[in-house]
C-alpha cells in the first residue's frame, strides 16, 4: 500500500506517532488525547 515508504513517523522532533490518518505529536504526561492532528506531523489536541 503506497509503494516504498518508511514504516515510521518521519517528522522533525520526537514524540510523534501514527494516530488516525497522520503522524501526530503525542500528548504530554498527565494529558489525554481529545482529537488527533489534521495534517502530517501536526499537533494533537490534548486535555
Amino acid at each position: 500500500q503506497g509503494g516504498t515508504r518508511s514504516p515510521r513517523c518521519d517528522c522533525a522532533g520526537d514524540f510523534h506517532k501514527k494516530i488516525g490518518l497522520f503522524c501526530c505529536r503525542g500528548c504530554p504526561a498527565g494529558h489525554y488525547l481529545k482529537a488527533p492532528c489534521t495534517e502530517p506531523c501536526g499537533n494533537s489536541t490534548c486535555l
Epitope: Q1, G2, G3, S6, K18, L21, P40, G42
Partner: antibody, heavy 123, light 111 residues
Framework: EVQLVESGGGLVEPGGSLKLSCAAS????????MSWVRQSPEKRLEWVAE????????YYPDIVTGRFTISRDDAKNTLFLEMSSLRSEDTAIYYC????????????????WGQGTSVTVSS | DIVLTQSPASLAVSLGQRATISCRAS??????????MQWYQQKPGQPPKLLIY???NVESGVPARFSGRGSGPDFSLNIHPVEEDDIAMYFC?????????FGGGTKLEIK
C-alpha cells in the same frame, strides 16, 4: 479489480435523515482509509467525511460536523455515512472513495471512486 | 481552509495541441519536500479518476500525454497532445491539511 458500490440515496425532506452504504471489493478494505466526497448539481466537489484504517478515527469539515457520521464494518467490507438534519444544500451525488497513502506520516490521494448515489433534499 | 483556485474555468483546444490548466492554493501545500497536490479527470456521467499525485507523479494506467508540475502554492496540469478522449472536467485537490479541498474545475473542450 477494485470496486466500490454505493447505495441508500434518494429523496428526503429537509430535516430528514438518510444512511448511505458502500460495498467494497477487490482489495483489503481494512487496511485503507476511506472517504465520502459529494458533487453538487453545479459539479463542485466537496469532501464530507473520512475514516482511518485500524483505529477508525473520523474527520469532517465544519459544514457537516454534528450532522454526518462516517463508520466502517471491516468484517463486511462496508463503509457507511449517516446523515441527519439534512438541508437543501446537501443535495448532491455522494461518492465512496478509497484513500491511498503514499507517506506513512500522512499523505493521501483518492485513487478509486464508486459510481455514486444521488441524494436530493427537497420538500 | 486551503482554497484552491483553478483557471481557466473552461478551455477549448485543437486536437494535437497543448492544454494547460492552473491551480493556485491559498498557501503552500508542501510537506517535507513533497507537494501534496492531486489532479483528477471526470468524464460526463462518470466519477472522478486520479491522474496525478504528489504534483507530478502519473498514476498507473494514465497516458503519458498527461503531466503535472509545480510547487509551493502554484501547480499546473498539461495535456499534450490533446485527444478527443480528453474531453472532461479536471479538478485539483490538496491533501496538505484537513479539510481536503478541491478546485472549482476546468472544462476542457475541443476547438
Amino acid at each position: 479489480e477494485v470496486q466500490l458500490v454505493e447505495s441508500g440515496g434518494g429523496l428526503v425532506e429537509p430535516g430528514g435523515s438518510l444512511k448511505l452504504s458502500c460495498a467494497a471489493s477487490g482489495f483489503t478494505f481494512s487496511t485503507y482509509a476511506m472517504s465520502w466526497v459529494r458533487q453538487s448539481p453545479e459539479k463542485r466537489l466537496e469532501w464530507v467525511a473520512e475514516i482511518s484504517s485500524g483505529d477508525s478515527y473520523t474527520y469532517y469539515p465544519d459544514i457537516v460536523t454534528g450532522r454526518f457520521t462516517i463508520s466502517r464494518d471491516d468484517a463486511k467490507n462496508t463503509l457507511f455515512l449517516e446523515m441527519s438534519s439534512l438541508r437543501s444544500e446537501d443535495t448532491a451525488i455522494y461518492y465512496c472513495v478509497r484513500d491511498q497513502d503514499y507517506r506513512y506520516d500522512g499523505y493521501y490521494a483518492m485513487d478509486h471512486w464508486g459510481q455514486g448515489t444521488s441524494v436530493t433534499v427537497s420538500s | 481552509d486551503i482554497v484552491l483556485t483553478q483557471s481557466p474555468a473552461s478551455l477549448a483546444v485543437s486536437l494535437g495541441q497543448r492544454a494547460t490548466i492552473s491551480c493556485r492554493a491559498s498557501e503552500s501545500v508542501e510537506h517535507y519536500g513533497t507537494s501534496l497536490m492531486q489532479w483528477y479527470q471526470q468524464k460526463p456521467g462518470q466519477p472522478p479518476k486520479l491522474l496525478i499525485y504528489a504534483a507530478s507523479n502519473v498514476e498507473s494506467g494514465v497516458p503519458a500525454r498527461f503531466s503535472g508540475r509545480g510547487s509551493g502554492p502554484d501547480f499546473s496540469l498539461n495535456i499534450h497532445p490533446v485527444e478527443e478522449d480528453d474531453i472532461a472536467m479536471y479538478f485539483c485537490q490538496q491533501s496538505r491539511r484537513i479539510p481536503w479541498t478541491f478546485g472549482g474545475g476546468t472544462k476542457l473542450e475541443i476547438k
